[in-house]
């Protein structure tokens, strides 16, 4: 099965990277993060039709079984394939420090 | 936020490992796999309520933003955290061979 990048549902409808602007309040971080005050959150959103960006064999199996048993087996889901690191300036017990988070921003997406 | 294992929706309703029995025909493998003739496919199925088995910071962000913008940001999704390898006896151009697939069966699950 081809792990295609062509979206049969129309442009932008399938699994891809989206950017959502969020404040510290939106994220529930206002009590422990000082900076940035707003985050451009990149996340994976969109449908995963048959074999679209299938991450691996498991995703291909899921597609086949979802077609057979849609009430039992869900379709593959659009999730990050990798992440971009990001720094947060955060309050800690010992004071303010810069911390790097490796799993905060999606870098690219696939279906699994 | 606690990445909890308690399902607020009731026993077995949240993201967990399920086993689905599938034939080679179900999987679309009949033309290239000889054995096994049936696969006990382990896959991740279930809901991902707030902070349930959150895989990482990204999953926690997704939960927060889904709560705020449910029409824009989907809830986290139940996907494999790791895999169990499996061997397939498959037809090749040169005959029959044993191949190990590392990404076929889900071993455990998380929400992302």
């Amino acid at each position: 099965a081809r792990n295609g990048d062509h979206c049969p549902l129309g442009p932008g409808r399938c699994c891809r990277l989206h950017t959502v602007r969020a404040s510290l309040e939106d994220l529930g971080w206002a009590d422990w993060v000082l900076s940035p005050r707003e985050v451009q959150v990149t996340m994976c959103i969109g449908a995963c039709p048959s074999q679209f960006r299938a991450a691996n064999m498991h995703a291909q199996i899921k597609t086949s079984l979802h077609r057979l048993k849609p009430d039992t087996v869900p379709a593959p889901c659009c999730v990050p394939a990798s992440y971009n690191p990001m720094v947060l300036i955060q309050k800690t017990d010992t004071g303010v420090s810069l911390q790097t988070y490796d799993d905060l921003l999606a870098k690219d997406c696939h279906c699994i | 936020a606690r990445n909890g294992d308690h399902c607020p929706l009731g026993p077995g309703r949240c993201c967990r490992l399920h086993t689905v029995r599938a034939s080679l025909e179900d999987l679309g493998w009949a033309d290239w796999v000889l054995s096994p003739r049936e696969v006990q496919v382990t896959m991740c199925i279930g809901a991902c309520p707030s902070q349930f088995r959150a895989a990482n910071m990204h999953a926690q962000i997704k939960t927060s933003l889904h709560r705020l913008k449910p029409d824009t940001v989907p809830a986290p999704c139940c996907v494999p955290a790791s895999y169990n390898p499996m061997v397939l006896i498959q037809k090749t151009d040169t005959g029959v061979s044993l191949q190990t697939y590392d990404d076929l069966l889900a071993k455990d699950c998380h929400c992302i």
Partner: antibody
């Protein structure tokens, strides 16, 4: 362990171009939010922020010097550069490069001294 | 540009005393103010961020306060190693600007 070290010519004549290099280790300038600033301090005087470069190559300059300043980076070699054209005696100072996460200055270099003299 | 004014260029204090260094912004900067300490012959070092939060590892005798236009760095139980120049800085808007500095002398 985060370190930054500035290097420069030490002495220049008026009207020449100053080229400064900040060599750093212990962090990557490819990480979202990370940046490096250049700040200078004439002997016995206060601090003056000159320029800042972010991970995504967004550049900010002090408007009072903007026409003379160019900041750039080479992420593969962990270096940030600052050029100041047409130097004058007023540019005599110690030049610091500073790591910043967003707007949080947490590590400073030891500084490099420039003397502009004819 | 936002001007940060530290009206006292020098302050004299004794070991064990409490001293307050003040800084005034020419316009509202919220709490987007940092304080730095520069000991003789050294590079500056961060003390306070976001007006009142100590940098990690900074002794708790250093306290920052204020918002809007008026900011204070208070050093309680002054130690001899606190002999230094103290600078405020605003990062509310570009260009980021520093105060002129306040030199703390120990009697």
């Amino acid at each position: 362990q985060v370190t930054l070290k500035e290097s420069g010519p030490g002495i220049l004549q008026p009207s020449q171009t100053l080229s400064l290099t900040c060599s750093f280790s212990g962090f990557s300038l490819t990480i979202s939010g990370m940046g490096v600033s250049w700040i200078r301090q004439p002997s016995g005087k206060g601090l003056e922020w000159l320029a800042h470069i972010y991970w995504d190559d967004d550049k900010r300059y002090n408007p009072s010097l903007k026409s003379r300043l160019t900041i750039s980076k080479d992420t593969s070699s962990n270096q940030v550069f600052l050029e100041i054209t047409s130097v004058d005696t007023a540019d005599t100072a110690t030049y610091y490069c500073v790591r910043a996460g967003w707007d949080f200055f947490d590590y400073w270099g030891q500084g490099t001294t420039l003397t502009v003299s004819s | 540009d936002i001007v940060m004014t530290q009206s006292q260029k020098f302050m004299s204090t004794s070991v064990g005393d409490r001293v307050s260094v003040t800084c005034k912004a020419s316009q509202n900067v919220g709490t987007n103010v940092a304080w730095y300490q520069q000991k003789p012959g050294q590079s500056p070092k961060g003390l306070i961020y976001s007006a009142s939060y100590r940098y990690s590892g900074v002794p708790d005798r250093f306290t920052g306060s204020g918002s809007g236009t008026d900011f204070t760095l208070t050093i309680s139980n002054v130690q001899s190693e606190d002999l230094a120049e103290y600078f405020c800085q605003q990062y509310n808007s570009y260009p980021w600007t520093f105060g002129g500095g306040t030199k703390l002398e120990i009697k």
